[in-house]
């Protein structure tokens, strides 16, 4: 049975030509992570294999950091990295578990603006 | 160069135990994580085994969990794979495998092999 | 366990053709998919990864593409030293898995 609960950054907001750190954190499971794998989309980003380590897609190495941790560093942010990121951890035994971060480039005066008037 | 070299191949007796070494060169080996491979006779590759770069963490397929130790020895260069309750499935050409580059996803080092055959 | 189908054990072609050599995923493996060339008495040599990047040193009659679950290695112009196996690998979840193989033969 799958008891595993993801906790992730939820939705984030950064400001163009800024960077980000997408965090995910699997918890509740003693089971083994064999590997993480970032999407955004459709498009697969980078695995951090438990054992043999990173591999980032040549598509997203220039812009693509690994860590830290499991997670993933997004630089020179431009407004199409707008949009949905998901951390996929492969387990033994439990299986996949799929979390989601929605991401906000903002031009930078707008998340400045954003920043100065946010609800508590 | 790199250069990776098995030995420690032989024939061994359903239910017996056998050790394989790979001696790895031209690299920085405490640095990058390990896998063992293996080619049956008709040809199928399978991945039986890897480990990180400092021996903390190993991952094993159901078809040889609980029978295959993987291990290094940093200091010697040395890769391992201890093989016990062996069975005639396990008969195929065991090859140690590397990759280095964050962007590589695969293996682009590997040895020449070593041979097991268990057989009565 | 991902399971990767290539259906052609054998192929078989003449120097100069264009070859396609397939492989299909049981389940979405998006771009982590390696392929490797092994001649007679050799390990195993990487090719292409990541779907599409060719290895250092690799002539560029060497494509890889892939279109949804199937994923393609293509030889422009066969060339004698090319007459090998090919293997497919995913490494998007573990276990990392491997094809059948495909056996390319001169006609």
């Known amino acids: 049975m799958m008891t595993g609960t993801i906790e992730t950054t939820g939705n984030i907001s950064a400001e163009k030509g800024g960077s980000i750190i997408l965090q995910c954190h699997l918890s509740s499971t003693t089971a083994q992570v064999t590997q993480v794998n970032w999407e955004q989309q459709d498009q697969l980003l980078a695995i951090c294999n438990a054992d043999l380590g990173w591999h980032i897609s040549p598509s997203f190495k220039d812009r693509v950091a690994p860590g830290p941790g499991l997670g993933l560093t997004l630089q020179s942010l431009t407004v199409n990295d707008t949009g949905e990121y998901f951390c996929i951890y492969h387990t033994y035994p439990d299986g996949t578990y799929t979390g989601r971060i929605f991401l906000e480039v903002l031009e930078s005066s707008v998340a400045e603006h954003g920043a100065r008037f946010q609800i508590p | 160069d790199v250069q990776l070299v098995e030995s420690g191949g032989g024939l061994v007796q359903p239910g017996g135990s056998l050790k394989l070494s790979c001696a790895a060169s031209?690299?920085?080996?405490?640095?990058?994580?390990m896998s063992w491979v293996r080619q049956t006779p008709d040809r199928r590759l399978e991945l039986v085994a890897t480990?990180?770069?400092?021996?903390?963490?190993?991952y094993y397929p159901d078809s040889v969990k609980g029978r295959f130790t993987i291990s290094r020895d940093n200091a010697r260069n040395t890769l391992y794979l201890q093989m016990s309750s062996l069975k005639s499935e396990d008969t195929a050409m065991y090859y140690c495998?590397?990759?280095?580059?964050?962007?590589?996803?695969?293996?682009?080092?590997w040895g020449q092999g070593t041979t097991l055959t268990v057989s009565s | 366990d991902i399971v990767l189908t290539q259906s052609h054990k054998f192929m078989s072609t003449s120097l100069g053709d264009r070859v396609s050599i397939t492989c299909k995923a049981s389940q979405d493996v998006s771009t982590a998919v390696a392929w490797y060339q092994q001649k007679p008495g050799q390990s195993p040599k990487l090719l292409i990864y990541?779907?599409?990047s060719r290895h250092t040193g690799v002539p560029d009659r060497f494509t890889g593409s892939r279109s949804g679950p199937d994923y393609t290695l293509t030889i422009s112009s066969v060339q004698a030293e090319d007459l090998a196996l090919y293997y497919c690998?995913?490494?998007?979840?573990?276990?990392?898995?491997f094809g059948g193989g495909t056996k390319l033969e001169i006609k």
């Open positions: 031209g690299f920085t080996f405490s640095s990058y994580g």
């Open positions: 990541w779907a599409s």
């Open positions: 690998q995913q490494q998007y979840s573990t276990p990392w898995t």
């Open positions: 480990i990180n770069n400092n021996g903390g963490s190993t």
């Open positions: 495998a590397t990759r280095t580059g964050t962007e590589i996803l695969g293996f682009d080092f």
